[in-house]
């Protein structure tokens, strides 16, 4: 039994890091393998993660962490019974994938303006709370070419757009994702999408 693709890990910079790897053949990850992880330089115990299968030879492990600070560095040991298959380290602050925003809501009752709001996925005491910026994706269910991205570079989790920038009388969907420039994170996953029917009054033409 050998590791074909070494574990790569990402952290949500809160309480979970996810590590993925591939074995050289079909493996029952949860019965055959264990991923041990331990903080370096701290009075902390070693923890064991039981991996799950992620495709035939793929494994994934969700490491539970007691919060995260920038200096944290973990040793990772991948075991198959008594055999050490791989040894490495992981610094969560250098591999951050933020949590996805939640509670995306489209408010259509503000004159002819669409107000999209969502929730910051972090509590106020988390370092990322004040550092997330967002991308909002809006698309038409009827027309695949009607697909747009709005970059929200301010901290407030909301976006206002004129309803007239979208076609009237058809349904749209929106979703939002987040990233933090300060930690050079990857983008989060997209939030669940929300749907609304776009309608607005055409401006009255004067002759």
């Amino acid at each position: 039994m050998k590791v074909l693709q070494e574990p790569t890990c990402v952290s949500d910079y809160m309480s979970i890091s996810t590590c993925e790897w591939k074995m050289n053949g079909p493996t029952n990850c949860s019965t055959e393998l264990r991923l041990l992880y331990q903080l370096v330089f701290l009075l902390s115990e070693a923890h064991t993660c039981i991996p799950e299968n992620n495709g035939g030879a793929g494994c994934v492990c969700h490491l539970l962490m007691d919060d995260v600070v920038s200096a944290d560095n973990y040793t990772l040991d991948l075991w198959a019974g008594q055999q050490l298959l791989w040894k490495g380290s992981f610094k969560p602050s250098e591999h951050v994938k933020p949590r996805a925003p939640g509670n995306l809501t489209v408010h259509t009752n503000v004159s002819d303006t669409l107000l999209l709001t969502w929730s910051n996925p972090y509590p106020p005491d988390n370092y990322l709370y004040n550092h997330l910026t967002y991308a909002v994706n809006i698309w038409s269910e009827n027309d695949p070419a009607d697909f747009r991205i709005y970059n929200v570079t301010y901290l407030e989790p909301s976006l206002r757009i004129a309803a007239s920038t979208l076609k009237s009388g058809i349904s749209y969907r929106a979703r939002v994702r987040a990233w933090a420039q300060c930690y050079n994170t990857t983008w989060s996953e997209w939030s669940p999408s929300t749907k609304w029917h776009n309608s607005y009054r055409e401006p009255f033409e004067q002759h």
């Epitope: 701290l42 902390s44 919060d67 600070v69 920038s70 250098e94 005491d125």
Partner: antibody
Framework: QVQLVESGGDLVRPGGSLRLSCTAS????????MSWIRQAPGKGLEWVSY????????YYADSVKGRFTISRDNAKNSLYLQMNSLRAEDTAVYYC?????????WGQGTTVTVSS | DIQMTQSPSSLSASVGDRVTITCRAS??????LAWFQQKPGKAPKSLIY???SLQRGVPSKFSGSGSGTDFTLTISSLQPEDFATYYC?????????FGQGTKLEIK
Amino acid sequence: QVQLVESGGDLVRPGGSLRLSCTASGFTLSDYYMSWIRQAPGKGLEWVSYIRRSGNTIYYADSVKGRFTISRDNAKNSLYLQMNSLRAEDTAVYYCARGGDWADVWGQGTTVTVSS
Amino acid sequence: DIQMTQSPSSLSASVGDRVTITCRASQGISIYLAWFQQKPGKAPKSLIYAASSLQRGVPSKFSGSGSGTDFTLTISSLQPEDFATYYCQQYNSYPYTFGQGTKLEIK
């Protein structure tokens, strides 16, 4: 407003013990990492210890490892530092501080003097 | 351990001056650097974190920059209340370490 107040500093003989306390107000202690940072007379700053929210993970500087114990009582909104086997070089102002990366809120400090 | 070296150790300046204090790390620390201000007999006060992010409530005359090993703290227009000792601190790796301090004095 957000405030940290330390107490327990005193004059103690080498080899003696002392327990410092820190009471938080204006925020919920359980939401934050908490730290002790010290400053010897006329000297710079040294990060002594910190404790994470749950209390499960603790960090100590090598200079105090095995002698100092940090703890927290979230119900009392309080942080503690038990200092044993004190040495002359532990003489300093001890600050209670909020944060586990950098300290964004500091107490006014309590003075510990170790001398015979 | 990562050594943090500040320069200059002391600095004389006048009200209205623009001053820059530098901090150098003995090895790369990404952007994991904070700056503090301390006045005699008082606790330090957080000014900057993540090398350039201003702590809430700190005036914008303070700014920080840098990444890797070289960092600067700039005060754009000195006021009487800014004369103090300034410290940098790295939190990239344990043990956390501070610079030796830069004492900013009135000329």
